[in-house]
């Protein structure tokens, strides 16, 4: 028997779009934009499980849905890769893999996933619930990292299947069928808006949810575009080192910590929705980290799909050696 | 561009202990191990250990453990490799390297003899 | 410990013409689930420090020339040199990548015939 901690981060969607919108038609251009906008938004997902021949031993598993190629991973416990994280293995896809204890295994599952198991005896193993932390570097979406651990083991409800297969035939599905989809959803906003340059916009109403919906952002991913991409997974986290995660950023800047609800992932639905807010904190969470390579010069404009952002202190660091940016 | 930067030669007793430095320049002195490879004259190379800086984790060479000790210091970013007990089989070039052996320190001669 | 067996211990070959040296490891190499052969190799001249030349069994690294070239899988690798300079006589090493400790060939001495 396993204990995991998985759950799907979608949701139904929300109520009251329709009416934000004015009219059922406007809604479809606005998915299409977000759809071909956020096409390429790669996510990060983690499983953490103990196993329960050995209470002691954790299985830690990591996988990158995106398109791009994996030029290195780094797995952290007690916080993110670089804020406060302890690095227990580094896997690069061909020069090999570092691991250092507890790490007992670390390998390549398959070509964009990897585990990694821990001993746990003595003063350097986990405790149940302690954060590990998976980053991605990747070209060219750049470095994505997500943190997760282990649920409290009394909570009956956080039971996920066996093999977070769905993981990985939702990324295959993504990279095949999106393709298409897109095309054709991109040609057919552009005839929906050519369409509508010759006639008056409708006036919208103003959104109840959001203030601020003037300042919607485009890049904004929206619940379909996640729901027609891929399903990623976020994993429930209840650390026993808050102060790890009250730390993991301390140079402010774009870093939201959007604490998500347990049986789901909040994500901006519609324009009214998409103004940055807070969720309120409910002792779980999810991250992705969206850090340039160094040659870039600079952060991108927006911080992946809409989930906690760990920016690096170091700034966007790049990897040595010639598959990373020097 | 990632460089490494070793001491000098050393001439040392047998009994006595060795430490070697490696000064890194270039890339996140923290990111990746340093590794340390020694080669007996005309003999092959040989791992020893490695360590981690940004937590000092380390990894030996079995046969090592016990008489070699990897240290790091970020501050200065430099990594140490200190070799106890030296014997006169012990003379080799020292080197440390990084990034899975992708760059590598010029190597320090060390010489164990009475 | 993987054990890493080069052969030949020393070769000889003309300029231009191909040279070939096999690696052999006690263990596969192979991980199995992104189907990469963990496998590095090595050139070490005269009093420098040795120089990676390709990882993966196959990916050269940055800046070494494309006369080299990496194959093989599992337990079986070979490093060729498809056409030899002058500046190529040097001593080859493979080294497994693949598991705790790292291990390395007893080197193959390349001189020109």
């Known amino acids: 028997m396993r204990t995991e901690a998985q759950v799907p981060a979608l949701q139904p969607p929300e109520p009251g779009l329709e009416g934000a919108m004015g009219h059922r038609t406007l809604v479809l251009p606005w998915v299409l934009l977000t759809l071909c906008v956020t096409a390429g938004t790669p996510e990060v997902w983690v499983q953490v499980r103990m196993e329960a021949t050995e209470l002691s031993s954790f299985t830690i598993r990591c996988g990158f849905l995106g398109s791009g190629s994996i030029s290195l991973v780094t797995v952290s416990w007690g916080g993110p890769n670089g804020a406060g994280g302890t690095t227990l293995a580094v896997l690069h896809p061909e020069r090999g893999i570092r691991q250092w204890a507890p790490a007992r295994q670390a390998r390549w599952e398959t070509q964009s996933s990897i585990s990694l198991i821990l001993e746990g005896s003595g003063a350097s193993s986990p405790c149940a619930n302690t954060t590990f932390c998976c980053k991605f570097a990747s070209f060219p979406e750049g470095s994505w990292e997500a943190c997760g651990s282990l649920p409290p083991s009394s909570d009956p409800g956080l039971s996920a299947p066996p093999t977070p297969a769905p993981i990985l035939r939702a990324d295959l599905a993504g990279i095949l069928g999106v393709s298409g989809v897109l095309l054709f959803g991109c040609v057919y906003l552009l005839h929906l808006l050519r369409r509508h340059k010759h006639r008056p916009a409708p006036r919208l109403q103003p959104s109840r949810t959001s203030p601020q919906a003037p300042r919607a952002r485009a890049w904004a991913p929206s619940q379909a575009s996640q729901a027609a991409l891929h399903v990623p997974y976020a994993t429930i986290n209840t650390s026993c080192r808050p102060a790890t995660l009250d730390t993991a950023h301390p140079h402010g800047g774009p870093s939201w910590w959007a604490s998500l609800p347990t049986h789901a992932a909040h994500r901006p639905q519609g324009p009214a929705a998409w103004a940055s807010t807070p969720i309120p904190a409910r002792g779980s969470f999810v991250s992705v980290e969206n850090g340039l390579y160094a040659q870039a010069g600079e952060r991108p404009p927006h911080t992946g799909p809409g989930l906690t952002l760990f920016p690096d202190p170091r700034g966007p660091r790049a990897m040595e050696g010639p598959l990373g940016v020097r | 561009e990632v460089q490494l930067v070793q001491s000098g030669a050393e001439v040392k007793k047998p009994g006595s202990s060795v430490k070697v430095s490696c000064k890194a320049s270039g890339g996140t002195f923290s990111s990746f191990s340093i590794e340390w490879v020694r080669q007996a004259p005309g003999q092959g190379l040989e791992w020893m250990g490695e360590?981690?800086?940004?937590?000092?984790?380390?990894n030996y060479n079995e046969k090592f453990k016990g008489r070699v000790t990897i240290t790091a210091d970020e501050s200065t970013s430099t990594a140490y490799m200190e070799l106890s007990s030296l014997r006169s089989e012990d003379t080799a070039v020292y080197y440390c390297?990084?990034?899975?052996?992708?760059?590598w320190g010029q190597g320090t001669l060390v010489t164990v003899s009475s | 410990d993987i054990v890493m067996t080069q052969s030949p211990d020393s070769l000889a070959v003309s300029l231009g013409e191909r040279a070939t040296i096999n690696c052999k490891s006690s263990?596969?190499?192979?991980?199995?689930?992104?189907?990469?052969?963990?496998l590095a190799w090595y050139q070490q001249k005269p009093g420098q420090p040795p120089k990676l030349l390709i990882y993966?069994?196959?990916t050269r690294e940055s800046g070494v020339p494309d006369r080299f070239s990496g194959s093989g899988s599992g337990t079986d690798f070979t490093l060729t040199i498809s056409s030899l300079q002058a500046e190529d006589v040097a001593v080859y090493y493979c080294?497994?990548?693949?598991?705790?400790?790292?291990?390395f060939g007893q080197g193959t001495k390349l001189e020109i015939k």
């Open positions: 993966g069994a196959s």
């Open positions: 080294q497994n990548a693949h598991s705790y400790p790292p291990t």
């Open positions: 390297a990084r990034y899975w052996f992708a760059y």
């Open positions: 360590i981690l800086p940004g937590s000092n984790s380390t």
């Open positions: 263990q596969s190499l192979l991980n199995s689930g992104n189907q990469k052969n963990y």
